[in-house]
Amino acid sequence: ARNGDRCPLGPGRCCRLHTVHASLEDLGWADWVLSPREVQVTMCIGACPSQFREANMHAQIKMNLHRLKPDTVPAPCCVPASYNPMVLIQKTDTGVSLQTYDDLLAKDCHCV
Amino acid sequence: ARNGDRCPLGPGRCCRLHTVHASLEDLGWADWVLSPREVQVTMCIGACPSQFREANMHAQIKMNLHRLKPDTVPAPCCVPASYNPMVLIQKTDTGVSLQTYDDLLAKDCHCV
């Protein structure tokens, strides 16, 4: 079996963690978040070729069926395997509050 | 906000559970699985337009950034939210064994 972390498409082309710099406006948060004003958003981007970072048996099945029926079954897709928490200072009716979100920033990635 | 389960692209076009009929050969299992000979594989297929079955805050961020930077950030993608277990009768060196897999068949879907 091919090494699950070696990308056959070339460096950086396969499913991995990327960082995208975004403002509150970019995120659509300007009306309800006060801080941070900018975020280094970590997300999972890249192709999922056969055997690359397969999350589970379902991903293996999906890849096999994709090769058989590419018009019906899509290839596995690159999604977060886990998340890093993030705190936001949110606007409220009376001022601000702190809220921690556990599902905001991707921590690592796999193919499902 | 649009109803998270109403597909704006038309019936059946958005992320949902599909069933694909597959043989052991299709799945690449013929050399190690004895039964079942055929499987009704449930998997998640379909588009993930804005606000449709968003799994979490990360999916919202991803969609907003995709609209801003479609060449850099892909749209959220349709993946299993949970799985149904499945029992396989596996070939072994000495005969057969029963093995339950918890991550084989998608049970429901969302966009991440």
Partner: antibody
Amino acid sequence: QVQLQESGPGLLKPSQTLSLTCTVSGFSLSTYGMGVGWIRQPAGKGLEWLANIWWNDDKYYNSALKSRLTISKDTSKNQVSLKLSSVTAADTAVYYCAQEVYGWFAYWGQGTLVTVSS
Amino acid sequence: DIQMTQSPSTLSASVGDRVTITCKASQNVGTNVAWYQQKPGQPPKALIYSASYRYSGVPDRFSGSGSGTDFTLTISSLQAEDVAVYYCQQYNSYPLTFGQGTKLEIK
């Protein structure tokens, strides 16, 4: 809920190194946007910010005390440590640690009194 | 370093009075100013973030305003429990700096 607890030696002699520990609960030191800062307050005086450390290990120090300060964290133990070397009587104060969120001290510990005396 | 200068240093007022404390930054800090209340024998407590946003749980008699270099904390109707020292703090740039404090007393 969020809690911070400072611990330290109480009494030191001049020229010694002060070692303080802040143990936190109710939040994670690895949460994006979260930091811990140290602030001190001599008796009857105002607040003086000393140092802080962020979730990503970025560190900042009071410019006047930078050469004497070291801040570090152990995320697995939920602890932040501050060291202040070559102490003098002028370093006698109540030392507070506080949860810092994007520059703002949202929650404070009760403080620990440190006295420097020969 | 950015200096934060509070005035007055001490303020005496009666219950029910409107009280104003000012804080002046030595350079533009936008709205990156917080206010804290410290009662005797206690740690400081956050009141205001980003110059004008009250922290959750803070009574609505407390309000903040200002931007750039001039900031104000106002107590619309002074209560006996508001006796404390009040501090402003800038977080526009490091090093973080506090004002010297304003001691609020009841007449």
